[in-house]
């Protein structure tokens, strides 16, 4: 399907809105430090030169990839070396090399101050004033935070940001309006970014074939009583997209995700029953809805997998003949009998499967070899099943809070090297997982949980690959994708670590602290808490909870006092004595 | 060993109710399928009702809207609840689940229904 010139193919297939929008997100991923200007007169740049190119598909430079096309613009850039160092070293190399070097240094940690909502009157008057360049600022605001964030799914969130401000901008409360909207945003914002980092890590760091396996679990579970024939054709298409928007090719992946949501409601019949209302909609709203759709009904007969995988002479035959799409098979009907399974147990019991297959059937009985075989799933089952069932019993004993605190001690102690930021950000979400899973019926936690934690731990992977200092971290991390979070389980203290030397400034405090949101205030304490435990890596829940709970009574009694800084300045050098003798 | 548990049968008046339940032990596997069969004196085995890990359910037109099939995840149990009776339903009533090694049945227990 080659066309004369990329970009006019391209700008004609996607519209020019969704086309600016989304060269403005990949020039925003790309130089993150770049002004808001700066980016939009590139846009416009390129966005003229499209229409040059639709409008004559033979005019010059319009037959340029789309790499060369857009690197070429990025590296016209001027303060390049000054504001991004050696990625301007880029700009001297030629495609494709050039976009993986731009790849290369993308920033999943910019130094960028954190977003400031203004006023809700102040944004409605901008929102007003200019409504384009409002929604820009969304696109750049964001896209330049989260540089792998799922192009074509951040423009849905830009649409929606707009219906939020048209809506509540005429509202006669607009605040009680606008902001539940905008934290639902927010949060949905940061978990989708989080959940496509997984997604480009998998891609990234462990191929295609790991993120083909992770699909055919997934879309089985979703869709089965779809054929595996089927299955296969969604889990290639999604394959290529993702491949796309990871490598920033984010014109070709919307592009292609929009004809993969044509294809599925087109196929709605062969593929699952639950595609009907989200086939009505608008296209963002549509591949939105498809994305996220229900579980479809089981079949009601689908017969036990012995016969097929177990107790056949075949075994062998079938596996040598198509390794791959034996294996599939297998992870698809596995998936589709077990929506209440994770993704990643489903993957760890199809590497399992894999692992005996090519044990036995190299052996002299292979039958006799792997007859056993689904008695090695035993503990893999077990594992995480025991883990959602423990967490969830101390998630309910203690509430959010102290439930992250409980983690921010864990996680501490087996990578005390990790930053304090990090460790804190990582355990306040890992710490999420209560009150988005333990509250659902038994039979969807597992998902739910382990799934989402494998999300985080990502998080984790990622800050630290930027820089590295544990080798725990970088082995739990590096070694398998699918073992990742059972690896975290399984680190204990690590008794090689020399504890921080105590520094009384980190464990002073200000009247500041009296001001702070109750989120922020929960912050300050837990990096209080990771640095304890730094510095105390041996120290019981009973001595650390003794501090917190006196360093949360000196707080109080400080934000109540009249002259509140003298307070912090008497009381603090006492807090800090007494949790010394206490921790001694 | 898989070890099925079944109780809950006896007699009851015609537009009574009886609840039957089955509680499965000795799997390293979830129960992907649990379901209720019946054989009256006879006849051919029949399926009652099953329900589904995502708790799909399907039941036999003659039961529909009587009969109520449930399961307790975390206990691996599989009840039916059966109401207004008719003598129609008398006969033993088996359990079945499965996993992805096998099918299992149950023992059976009696349901009589009569005035």
């Known amino acids: 399907d080659t066309h004369k010139s990329e970009v006019a193919h391209r700008f004609k297939d996607l519209g020019e809105e969704h086309f600016k929008g989304l060269v403005l997100v990949a020039f925003s991923q790309y130089l993150q430090q770049c002004p808001f200007e700066e980016h939009v007169k590139l846009v416009n740049e390129v966005t003229e030169f499209a229409k040059t190119c639709v409008a004559d598909e033979s005019a010059e430079n319009c037959d340029k990839s789309l790499h060369t096309l857009f690197g070429d613009k990025l590296c016209t850039v001027a303060t390049l070396r000054e504001t991004y160092g050696e990625m301007a070293d880029c700009c001297a190399k030629q495609e494709p090399e050039r976009n993986e070097c731009f790849l290369q240094h993308k920033d999943d940690n910019p130094n960028l101050p954190p977003l400031v909502r203004p006023e809700v009157d102040v944004m409605c008057t901008a929102f007003h004033d200019n409504e384009a360049t409002f929604l820009k600022k969304y696109l750049y605001e964001v896209a330049r935070r989260h540089p792998y964030f799922y192009a074509p799914e951040l423009l849905f969130f830009a649409a929606r940001y707009k219906a939020a401000f048209a809506e509540c901008c005429q509202a006669a409360d607009k605040a009680a309006c606008l902001l539940p909207k905008l934290d639902e945003l927010r949060d949905e914002g940061k978990a989708s970014s989080a959940k496509q980092r997984l997604k480009c890590a998998s891609l990234q760091k462990f191929g295609d074939r790991a993120f083909k396996a992770w699909a055919v679990a997934r879309l089985s579970q979703k869709f089965p009583k779809a054929e595996f024939a089927e299955v296969s054709k969604l889990v290639t298409d999604l394959t290529k997209v993702h491949t796309e928007c990871c490598h920033g090719d984010l014109l070709e992946c919307a592009d292609d995700r929009a004809d993969l949501a044509k294809y599925m409601c087109e196929n709605q019949d062969s593929i699952s029953s639950k595609l009907k209302e989200c086939c009505d909609k608008p296209l963002l709203e549509k591949s939105h809805c498809l994305a996220e759709v229900e579980n479809d009904e089981m079949p009601a007969d689908l017969p036990s997998l012995a016969a097929d995988y177990v107790e056949s002479k075949d075994v062998c035959k079938n596996y040598a003949e198509a390794k791959d799409v034996f294996l599939g098979m297998f992870l698809y009907e596995y998936a589709r009998r077990h929506p209440d399974y994770s993704v990643m147990l489903l993957l760890r019991l199809a590497k399992a499967y894999e692992a005996t297959l090519e044990k036995c059937c190299a052996a002299a009985d292979p039958h006799e070899c792997y007859a056993k075989v689904f008695d090695e799933f035993q503990p893999l089952v077990e594992e995480p099943q025991n883990l959602v069932k423990q967490n969830c019993e101390l998630f309910e004993q203690l509430g959010e809070y102290k439930f992250q605190n409980a983690l921010l001690v864990r996680y501490t102690k087996k990578v005390p090297q990790v930053s304090t930021p990090t460790l804190v950000e990582v355990s306040r979400n890992l710490g999420k997982v209560g009150a988005k899973c333990c509250k659902l019926p038994e039979a969807k936690r597992m998902p739910c949980a382990e799934d989402y934690l494998s999300v985080v731990l990502n998080r984790l992977c990622v800050l630290h690959e930027k820089t590295p200092v544990s080798e725990k971290v970088t082995k739990c991390c590096t070694e398998s994708l699918v073992n990742r979070r059972p690896c975290f389980s399984a680190l204990e203290l690590d008794e090689a670590y020399v504890p921080k030397a105590f520094n009384a400034e980190t464990f002073t405090f200000h009247a500041d602290m009296c001001t702070l949101s109750e989120k922020e205030k929960q912050v300050k304490k837990q990096t209080a808490l990771v640095e304890l435990v730094k510095h105390k890596p041996k120290a019981t829940k009973e001595q650390l909870k003794g501090v917190m709970d006196n360093f949360a009574a000196f707080v109080e009694k400080c934000c109540k006092a009249d002259d509140k800084e003298a307070c912090f300045a008497e009381e603090g050098p006492k807090f800090v004595a007494a949790s010394q003798a206490a921790l001694a | 060993q898989v070890q099925l548990q079944e109780s809950g049968g006896g007699l009851v008046q015609p537009g009574g109710s009886l609840r039957l339940s089955c509680a499965a032990s000795?799997?390293?596997?979830?129960?992907?399928?649990m379901a209720w069969y019946r054989r009256a004196p006879g006849k051919e085995r029949e399926l009652v009702a099953l329900?589904?890990?995502?708790?799909?359910?399907n039941y036999a037109d003659s039961v529909k809207g009587r009969f109520t099939i449930s399961r307790d995840y975390a206990k691996n149990t599989v009840y039916l609840q059966m109401d207004s009776l008719k003598p129609e339903d008398t006969a033993a009533y088996y359990c079945?689940?499965?996993?992805?090694?096998?099918?299992?049945w149950g023992q059976g227990t009696q349901v009589t229904v009569s005035s």
């Open positions: 079945n689940v499965r996993n992805v090694e096998r099918d299992y």
């Open positions: 329900i589904t890990t995502d708790t799909s359910t």
């Open positions: 000795g799997s390293i596997f979830t129960f992907y399928r």
